[in-house]
């Protein structure tokens, strides 16, 4: 949602957390800023402070329950605004009816860990995190290894189309050491993107076996 | 019915202090703001500043800092505004005025009767 | 502080007959949030003020339709189309865009 030349974007990451940013240029400066969440059909609304992460912009997290607990659903509708303090009043800077199914970021994959390890291939595993049960098997991941003398940037892209919490690395280098890198993102939502990286998992492929004299 | 009543005129020397009341009745008072506003003799409007009853924060313009002090008392639902160091200048009429707690439309809409304030030697 | 300048100080006119108070603004006074926060306020012989206007055109409940504003940016309008007796007093406008809140001057308005 944009108002005047500010620029208020949300996701909600499918359990009990609405991620707000808010950037507005020439922003007023030493002045408190909140999000407040009204639920079109809930008893409860929330409210977050917002915090700077850059010179004209501000986060926070709504959260909404215990980070497990399945808040809202497909049918909701969440008023969520930006309320900013001027003199002893509050004055809303922005506003948006978040359709939180729209508008969803799961959160960063976790417990990444090497399954099996050999000379040129690896086995990965991961679990999802906080995810919708809503999503039964409706999830898509993005892959990526980070190969000695190169960026994250210029690692290649693995897709896989399905709920799949592994993957089988091939044509490896041995004794080399490499960092592996998923994401998640349901399949539902106008507006949903890539959950953030997952941190990184270092390993190292086995040293090839030495030849016989 | 919305209502603010304000106490009535006062006559100070100057250097001394003058405290007005505003009561208000019709609504809840700690849902809404308590602007300030003065109108010095055949002179305009002057915004001095305001406060929450909810939480008793304040805002004062600079103009008045130092000077002056808004408090209020919700077991009565009244407002007050003490001004200091008082000088002939002061003399004026002070208005209380209502206004919603999240400025979306307007600032003030319904105002108290007025409290003439004189200074005088 | 943003300035609030209204012209003329004192308009008389005829009962019937349209009047028109104009008031410009030191800074612009569209705020960060996109609204533009410029009221109107009367204040009739012997009374308190009044709220008329506010956000620039929208009249406030029980204010005839007489009455209306208009302008942008540093210079607003406000008009009367046809002035009763009771329109007499004197007008202010207000930004309560920019803290510290400012008014106008005032502009008496008085039948001739």
């Known amino acids: 949602a944009v108002n005047g030349t500010s620029r208020f974007t949300c996701f909600y990451n499918s359990r009990a957390n609405i991620s707000c940013v808010w950037s507005q240029d020439g922003a007023l400066q030493d002045t408190s800023c909140q999000v407040h969440a009204w639920p079109d059909r809930r008893r409860w609304n929330q409210t977050c402070e917002l915090l700077p992460v850059s010179q004209a912009s501000w986060a926070c997290n709504l959260i909404l329950g215990t980070p497990d607990s399945q808040k809202l659903t497909a049918v909701d509708i969440v008023t969520l605004r930006v309320m900013c303090r001027e003199g002893v009043r509050w004055r809303m800077m922005a506003i948006q009816d978040f359709k939180p199914f729209e508008n969803l970021r799961l959160m960063a994959p976790i417990s990444l860990q090497v399954v099996h390890v050999e000379t040129h291939r690896c086995n990965i595993s991961w679990k999802i995190s906080q995810a919708s049960h809503y999503f039964e098997r409706h999830l898509e991941f993005e892959a990526r290894t980070l190969s000695p003398g190169h960026t994250w940037e210029e690692a290649p892209l693995m897709t896989l189309k399905q709920k799949q919490e592994w993957i089988c690395l091939e044509t490896l280098t041995p004794d080399t050491q490499y960092e592996f890198q998923v994401r998640v993102k349901p399949l539902q939502g106008e507006f949903t993107t890539w959950s953030p990286w997952s941190q990184p998992l270092a390993f190292r492929t086995k040293p090839a076996a030495l030849g016989k004299d | 019915e919305v209502q603010l009543v304000q106490s009535g005129a006062e006559v100070k020397k100057p250097g001394a202090s003058v405290k007005v009341s505003c009561k208000a009745s019709?609504?809840?008072?700690?849902?809404?703001?308590i602007s300030w506003v003065r109108q010095a003799t055949g002179q305009g409007l002057e915004w001095m500043g305001e406060?929450?009853?909810?939480?008793?924060?304040?805002y004062y313009n600079e103009m008045f800092k130092g000077r002056v002090t808004m408090t209020r008392d919700t077991s009565i639902s009244t407002a007050y505004m003490e001004l200091s160091s008082l000088r002939s200048e002061d003399t004026a009429v002070y208005y209380c005025a209502r206004g919603s707690y999240t400025y979306d439309n307007y600032a003030m809409d319904f105002w108290g009767q007025g409290t003439t304030v004189t200074v005088s030697s | 502080d943003v300035v609030m300048t209204q012209t003329p100080l004192s308009l008389p006119v005829t009962l019937g007959q349209p009047a028109s108070i104009s008031c410009r603004s030191s800074q612009n006074i569209v705020h960060s949030n996109g609204n533009t926060y410029l009221e109107w306020y009367q204040q009739r012989p012997g009374q308190s003020p009044r709220l008329l206007i506010y956000k620039v055109s929208n009249r406030f409940s029980g204010v005839p339709d007489r009455f209306s504003g208009s302008g942008s940016g540093t210079d607003f309008t406000l008009k009367i189309s046809r002035v009763e007796a009771e329109d007499v007093g004197v007008y202010y406008c207000f930004q309560g865009s920019h803290i510290p809140w400012t008014f106008g001057g005032g502009t008496k308005v008085e039948i001739k």
């Open positions: 406060i929450y009853p909810g939480d008793g924060n304040t």
């Open positions: 019709g609504y809840t008072f700690t849902d809404y703001v």
